[in-house]
Amino acid sequence: SSSPTSSASSFSSSAPFLASAVSAQPPLPDQCPALCECSEAARTVKCVNRNLTEVPTDLPAYVRNLFLTGNQLAVLPAGAFARRPPLAELAALNLSGSRLDEVRAGAFEHLPSLRQLDLSHNPLADLSPFAFSGSNASVSAPSPLVELILNHIVPPEDERQNRSFEGMVVAALLAGRALQGLRRLELASNHFLYLPRDVLAQLPSLRHLDLSNNSLVSLTYVSFRNLTHLESLHLEDNALKVLHNGTLAELQGLPHIRVFLDNNPWVCDCHMADMVTWLKETEVVQGKDRLTCAYPEKMRNRVLLELNSADLDCDPILPPSLQTS
C-alpha cells in the first residue's frame, strides 16, 4: 500500500479554515475530504492511517487512485462509493489494513472504471457473495475489475465464523460470473486448506494467480486446463506433498506459465517419481533446483532434481495377516 507524500506540493490537504466560508453552499465538486490529501494533477486521493470510520462522502469527482488504507472502516455497505455524479474515473482502490470485517452486496457498485481493488489485511469474516457482482442474478453485468488483491483476509482463528472461509471467498469470486475479465488474483496468506474445484474454470482470463503461504495439501481436484492465458502461478509456502500426473500435464500444457513451488514439504517416496521426471524435463518451474524433500526422514533436504527412481521407494504395506499387533 502506498503512503501519502505530505511534502509533495501537488497535494492539497483539506482546509479547515475554509469551512465557515462555504458551509452555506453545497460542497465543492473537487474539494478534498477532511483527513485526506488530494492531487488533482495525479488524480489521486490519499486518506491513509487516519482512523476513518466511514468512506468520505465528499470525494472529488476527478479521483482515479484512491488510498483508504490503515483506517477503521469495519463495514463497507452497499453503494459505499456511489456518488452523484458517480466516481466515473476511479480505477484503483486500495482499502488494505482498514479493519474491514464485513463487505456487503453491491459495495463497489457505480464504479464503472474500477480495475484494481485491494482488500488485503482485512479480517473479512463476512464477505457477501455479491460483494463484487453487485446483484444476486445468476449472470450479472460484467465487473470492470482486472486485479483483485485479497492477501491475508482471513480473520484470526478465534474470530472466524463457523463456515468454510474458502467457500465464502470463492462464492464472492464466482457470483454472477461477474469476474470473467479478471487477470490478476492474489489470495496469499489465507490459511486455505483446499481450492474449490470449480473456481479456476470460471476465471478464464487469469494471467496471474497467487496462492502462496496457504495450507494447500493437494491440487488433485483443481483444474488449470481452461487457464490458457495463465503466466504465473504462485504456490510457494503451502503444504503440498506431491503433484500428480494430471496436474503436471495440465501445467505443461499452458503456453505461458511460470510456476513457483518453493518451501513445500515434498514427500519423496514412490509417488514422487512422476513429478521428479517432469521437473527434470520442464522449463515452467522457476527455481526448480531449490526444491527439496521434507519426508521421509532419510530423504530430508535431498534436492528433487538429483533423485532417481531407485531413491523413491515406498515401504511395503503388509497384508493384515502378517501385521504384528
Epitope: N51, T53, Q72, L73, A74, V75, S98, R99, L100, D101, E102, N122, P123, A125, D126, P155, E159
Partner: nanobody, 122 residues
Framework: EVQLVESGGGEVQPGGSLRLSCAAS????????MAWFRQAPGKEREFVAA????????RYTESVKGRFTISRDNAKNTVYLQMSSLRAEDTAVYYC???????????????WGQGTLVTVKP
C-alpha cells in the same frame, strides 16, 4: 438476544482514571458491534465509543478521543472502556450496547445493559 452486564463505575477526581467492563452472554458474537453510550442527568443518551468483535475496529465521539480507549477480549466475551483524564462533564450513567451496525445512533443498537454510574468530582 445478548445479555449485557456493566461494572467498574464509581467516584473519581478530575484527571483520574476508571475502567468499565461489559460482560456479554447469550450469543455475543451475533452482535457485530459493541458500544458504550452515556447519559448525564437531564440530557439525552449519547454515543461514546464502539468496537467490532471481529477485527477490532474502533470509533469514538470527538470529546473523548485521546482520553478513552475501547477494547474487547473475545475469549472472555468482555468489552472494556478505559477512561483517563476524566472531567466533570464525563459524569453520567454509562451503558453498554450491542448491535449489528457500525453506527453512533441509539437505534443502531438492539441490546442494552442496565448501566453503571461514573461520577467525576473534586
Amino acid at each position: 438476544e445478548v445479555q449485557l452486564v456493566e461494572s467498574g463505575g464509581g467516584e473519581v477526581q478530575p484527571g483520574g482514571s476508571l475502567r468499565l467492563s461489559c460482560a456479554a452472554s447469550g450469543r455475543p458474537f451475533s452482535s457485530k458491534t459493541m458500544a458504550w453510550f452515556r447519559q448525564a442527568p437531564g440530557k439525552e443518551r449519547e454515543f461514546v465509543a464502539a468496537v467490532r468483535w471481529i477485527g477490532g475496529a474502533t470509533r469514538y465521539t470527538e470529546s473523548v478521543k485521546g482520553r478513552f480507549t475501547i477494547s474487547r477480549d473475545n475469549a472472555k466475551n468482555t468489552v472494556y472502556l478505559q477512561m483517563s483524564s476524566l472531567r466533570a462533564e464525563d459524569t453520567a450513567v454509562y451503558y453498554c450496547a450491542a448491535g449489528q451496525a457500525w453506527g453512533t445512533k441509539f437505534t443502531d443498537y438492539s441490546d442494552w445493559g442496565q448501566g453503571t454510574l461514573v461520577t467525576v468530582k473534586p
